[in-house]
Interface confidence: low
């Protein structure tokens, strides 16, 4: 950005700047971030017996250690490894649900279909969902004023690197048939630059994953097109096939009916297409 150019010209390091000059383009750390993370951790471990052994104070310490005192444009996946280790969790085969640009519906689905899991149904995803955080170089403070924006400032920021790290791990541990929910209302139904397109697709393990099944969610009630024929879906099929993973695609024409039929599969209207 322009600010970066000025600093580069003056050969001033970010950490040498007065505090008021360290303004990033993105919004600051979510209010009460530490307490929110800890409260979510305690709540998660209460509800998930298999994670009762997790010490939430240690989880917070590892989370904090990944970004506190570090220059927030120089965060690495390595920084998050202690946290990833503490949050190790496995999903049964055939039960992984990935999503791209359609988070709400994916979460509504796993709330009903309790034996399927998105990343945000796992401990680490649950802790960080919808939160923003960053620190400051050489201080122990959390920056509540501003954090780096992925486009305007830098991609190696604490939030982006976190999601890249945990998404990679989530994809690596998937097995069986993996499902992905895609937004059929977007111009790019499959976007190579999304987390799904740039991280998860490339980290599915062919020796463990037999197939990827895409569910393309239609937006309009009268939309009867076969979006599985969309050029971007064909691109996804090509990437997946080259990785020796089979590819299937389904149109979900009526997402409302789709959810209703997940809740009540015996409903007579669910025997027809959705």
């Amino acid at each position: 950005s322009g600010l970066n150019d000025i600093f580069e010209a003056q050969k001033i390091e970010w950490h040498e700047l007065p505090r008021w000059r360290q303004q990033w383009s993105g919004s600051g750390t979510t209010s009460r971030f530490p307490e929110t993370v800890l409260a979510r951790c305690v709540k998660y471990t209460e509800v998930h017996p298999e994670m009762r052994h997790v010490d939430c104070q240690s989880v917070w310490d590892a989370f904090k250690g990944a970004f506190i005192s570090k220059y927030p444009c120089n965060i690495t996946e390595e920084d998050y490894q202690p946290l990833v280790k503490l949050g190790t969790q496995t999903v049964p085969c055939n039960k992984t649900l990935l999503w791209s640009r359609i988070k709400d519906l994916a979460h509504q689905f796993t709330q009903v279909q309790r034996d399927m899991f998105t990343l945000e149904d796992m401990l680490l995803g649950y802790l960080a969902d919808d939160l923003t955080w960053c620190g400051e170089f050489n201080t122990f403070e959390i920056n509540y004023q501003s954090c780096p924006d992925w486009r305007k400032d830098c991609s190696n920021n604490p939030v982006s690197v976190f999601w890249k790290t945990v998404s990679r791990r989530f994809a690596e541990t998937a097995c069986g048939v993996v499902h992905v929910m895609l937004n059929g209302s977007r111009s790019k139904i499959f976007d190579k630059n999304s987390t799904f397109g740039s991280v998860e697709v490339h980290n599915l393990q062919p020796e463990k994953v037999q197939a990827l099944e895409a569910w393309v969610i239609h937006g309009g009630r009268e939309d009867s097109r076969d979006l599985c024929q969309d050029p971007t879906i064909k691109e996804l099929e090509s990437i997946i096939s080259k990785r020796n993973i089979r590819f299937f695609c389904k149109n979900i024409y009526r997402p409302d009916k789709f959810l209703q039929c997940v809740k009540n599969p015996e409903d007579s209207s669910c025997l027809s297409g959705i």
Epitope: T30, S31, E35, A39, C56, Q57, W60, Y144
Partner: antibody
């Protein structure tokens, strides 16, 4: 791990006081919600205020706003300041630790504050 | 502020008996409710959190249930050591506030 309150005693109406909650066996540099609760003689528990030790953000019962101030004063102490004391403030004041989700699993023994002329 | 209404204010039961204490919240609080036991001259002791989860080291004779606005604490196979005052507490935390409220308390007398 324990909490110990101090600063109680006999105080004049209209006066001020500061109660201290000292933590031992753990550090408030870690993330906890620390709270103050009071109990008038023979009465029930009444929540006063909480502070998040990570963010420093505070929350008060509606009736406590303005006259009570909770603060983290060091890595081992949380303080409750009270002003404009009245006889109705006579109570045992407890501090409690919450590891972050409402489970107040550690309490101090309490300190008695008596407001009387 | 949330108001917690606890009933009854006092209850008497024999050793080996069962006691039920009810707590009603003025607005829905999900399952974010705790129960405490307090004996004279002592601070409260956490019994149950998340409406039904037993705190560490607490006897399984204590059982919490309910969600939303209606909650119940049941003490079965009553022991003389259970004589105490019991309080419910709502703790409907969000990322922006830590509101808490206690019920008025229920004194349990064991005959």
């Amino acid at each position: 791990q324990e909490l110990v309150e101090s600063g109680g005693g006999l105080f004049q109406p209209g006066g001020s006081l500061a109660l201290t909650c000292k933590a031992s066996g753990f550090s408030l540099s870690n993330i906890y919600v620390m709270c103050w609760v009071r109990q008038a003689p023979g009465k029930g528990l009444e929540w006063i205020a909480c502070i998040g030790t990570g963010s420093g953000d505070t929350d008060y019962a509606t009736w406590a706003k303005g006259r009570f101030t909770i603060s983290k004063t060091s890595s081992t102490t949380v303080t409750l300041q009270m002003t404009s004391l009245t006889a109705a403030d006579t109570a045992t004041y407890f501090c409690a630790r919450d590891p972050g989700a409402g489970t107040w699993n550690l309490w101090g023994p309490g300190t008695l504050v008596t407001v009387s002329s | 502020d949330i108001v917690m209404t606890q009933t009854p204010s006092s209850v008497e039961a024999a050793v080996g008996g069962t006691v039920t204490i009810k707590c009603q919240a003025s607005q829905t609080i999900g399952s974010r409710l705790a129960w405490y036991q307090q004996k004279p001259g002592q601070p409260p002791k956490l019994l149950i959190y998340s409406a039904s989860t037993l705190a560490s080291g607490v006897s399984s004779r204590f059982k919490g249930s309910g969600s939303g606005t209606q909650f119940t604490l049941t003490i079965s196979d009553l022991d003389s050591a259970d004589a105490a005052t019991y309080y419910c507490q709502s703790y409907y935390y969000t990322s922006t506030s830590y509101p808490n409220a206690f019920g008025g308390g229920t004194e349990v007398v064991v005959k």
